[in-house]
C-alpha cells in the first residue's frame, strides 16, 4: 500500500516517498520507482536554503549601491546576500532596502527639522495629544483625532505613536 | 510639505529627444534616491531606473538602458530624465518617485508624452 | 527579472465586506510595498515593508507574507477604495511591479 506520509527530508509524489533536494540544490525531476530524485546544484547567484522540492533557486539579493547599499556578506548557493547601508547613511525603514544620507524618525518621533545640505533630520518625542506611527525623514507628530467633532467618543487612548481610536457613543444612559 | 513638481505634457515627433524634469520642494533632493516610472495606457508601471542624488550614480533596467538618461542638478533640487530616439512605443505618463521609506513615498504628478508625426 | 502576479485582475466588492488581492513572485522576495492609484491620479505608497501602513492609509487596511506570497486586506471595504492596487519588490534588478488589481465598489 502507498505511504501516506513521508518522514523528515522526504515529501510525497505520485504515492512515493521521494528525498527532497538539499540547500544549495533544486529539483529536476521528480523519483519513480526506479530512479531517485534529480537535483542540481544552484546557478551562480542563486540560492535555496532549506530541504526543498521547487525547480528554482532563489536570486541572491542585489545591494544596489545607488540605494546607498553595500554588501554585509556575500551570499552562497545556500544563504542570501546581506546588505547594509554605506558609511554614513541610513536604513529608510527596519527592511533596510534602501538608505538615504539623512536619519528617518522613529514612530513616537516627529520631524522637527527636515534635513538641509548640511544639517540630518532633527527629531523630536511626539507630546502628549500627538502621535506618529511611521518612521519618516519629513513627517510632523500629527494630533490625535478629536472624536468630539465626529460626535463620536474615544474607544481607545492614543499614545506617541498611534491615533486615538473613536467609537459610537453608548446610547443606554 | 514634501512635493514633486514635474513639467508639462510634451507632443515630440518620432525619432526626436526630451528631457523631463522633477523638481522637488519641501526638502533638499541630496541623499534621497529618485526613481522613474513609466505607466503606458493608464495600465502597468514600469521602472526605468533611479539616481542616486548624492553621488550621481545610477541604475537602469537593462529595457530602458540607451533609451533614458537619468541626471539630477543639486543645486536647484531638481532630477531629469532625457528620452532618446523616441517612437509610438514610449507614449506614455512618466512619473518621478522619490524614495524615504523603503517604498517610493512621493510621487510627481506625471509627465504625458505623446509621439506623433 | 522577478515577476509580481497579482490576482485577481479586477474585483468587485460591496461596501462592508472584506477583500483580499494576492501578489505572487516568480522568486522570493523579503519583502513587498504597495500603491494605490486612482483613475487620473499618481500612485501613492500605501503599505510599505510588507505590512507597515504608510501615514493616512486607514486601519482597515493590512499587508502580509513572506517568500513568494503576499496579499493586500481590507476588512469593511468603503466606497474610497475603489482604486487599482500595485505591488513592487526592491530585490533585484529590474525593481518591478506587478499588474496592478483593479477594486470596484458596487
Known amino acids: 500500500e502507498p505511504p501516506t506520509a513521508c518522514s523528515d527530508k522526504q515529501y510525497l509524489h505520485d504515492g512515493q516517498c521521494c528525498d527532497l533536494c538539499q540547500p544549495g540544490s533544486r529539483l529536476t525531476s521528480h523519483c519513480t520507482a526506479l530512479e531517485k530524485t534529480q537535483c542540481h546544484p544552484c546557478d551562480s547567484g542563486e540560492f535555496s536554503a532549506q530541504w526543498n522540492r521547487e525547480i528554482r533557486c532563489h536570486q541572491h539579493k542585489y545591494c544596489d549601491p545607488n540605494l546607498g547599499l553595500r554588501v554585509q556578506q556575500k551570499g552562497t548557493s545556500e544563504t542570501d546576500t546581506i546588505c547594509t547601508c554605506e558609511e554614513g547613511w541610513h536604513c529608510t525603514s527596519e527592511a533596510c532596502e534602501s538608505c538615504v544620507l539623512h536619519r528617518s524618525c522613529s514612530p513616537g518621533f516627529g520631524v522637527k527639522q527636515i534635513a538641509t545640505g548640511v544639517s540630518d533630520t532633527i527629531c523630536e518625542p511626539c507630546p502628549v495629544g500627538f502621535f506618529s506611527n511611521v518612521s519618516s525623514a519629513f513627517e510632523k507628530c500629527h494630533p490625535w483625532t478629536s472624536c468630539e467633532t465626529k460626535d463620536l467618543v474615544v474607544q481607545q487612548a492614543g499614545t506617541n505613536k498611534t491615533d486615538v481610536v473613536c467609537g459610537p457613543q453608548d446610547r443606554l444612559r | 510639505e514634501v512635493q514633486l513638481q514635474q513639467s508639462g505634457p510634451e507632443l515630440v515627433k518620432p525619432g526626436a529627444s526630451m528631457k523631463i524634469s522633477c523638481k522637488a520642494s519641501g526638502y533638499s533632493i541630496t541623499g534621497y534616491t529618485m526613481n522613474w516610472v513609466k505607466q503606458s495606457h493608464g495600465k502597468n508601471l514600469e521602472w526605468i531606473g533611479l539616481i542616486n542624488t548624492y553621488t550621481g550614480g545610477t541604475t537602469y533596467n537593462q529595457k530602458f538602458k540607451g533609451k533614458a538618461t537619468l541626471t539630477v542638478d543639486k543645486s536647484s533640487s531638481t532630477a531629469y530624465m532625457e528620452l532618446l530616439s523616441l517612437t509610438s512605443e514610449d507614449s506614455a505618463v512618466y512619473y518621478c518617485?522619490?524614495?524615504?521609506?523603503?517604498?517610493?513615498?512621493?510621487w510627481g504628478q506625471g509627465t504625458s508624452v505623446t509621439v506623433s508625426s | 527579472q522577478i515577476v509580481l502576479t497579482q490576482s485577481p485582475a479586477i474585483m468587485s466588492s460591496s461596501p462592508g465586506e472584506k477583500v483580499t488581492m494576492t501578489c505572487s513572485a516568480s522568486s522570493s522576495v523579503s519583502y513587498i510595498h504597495w500603491y494605490q492609484q486612482k483613475s487620473g491620479t499618481s500612485p501613492k505608497r500605501w503599505i510599505y515593508?510588507?505590512?507597515k501602513l504608510a501615514s493616512g492609509v486607514p486601519a482597515r487596511f493590512s499587508g502580509s507574507g513572506s517568500g513568494t506570497s503576499y496579499s493586500l486586506t481590507i476588512n469593511s471595504v468603503e466606497a474610497e477604495d475603489a482604486a487599482t492596487y500595485y505591488c513592487q519588490q526592491w530585490r533585484t534588478n529590474p525593481y518591478t511591479f506587478g499588474g496592478g488589481t483593479k477594486l470596484e465598489i458596487k
Open positions: 518617485a522619490g524614495t524615504g521609506t523603503g517604498a517610493m513615498d512621493y
Open positions: 515593508d510588507t505590512s
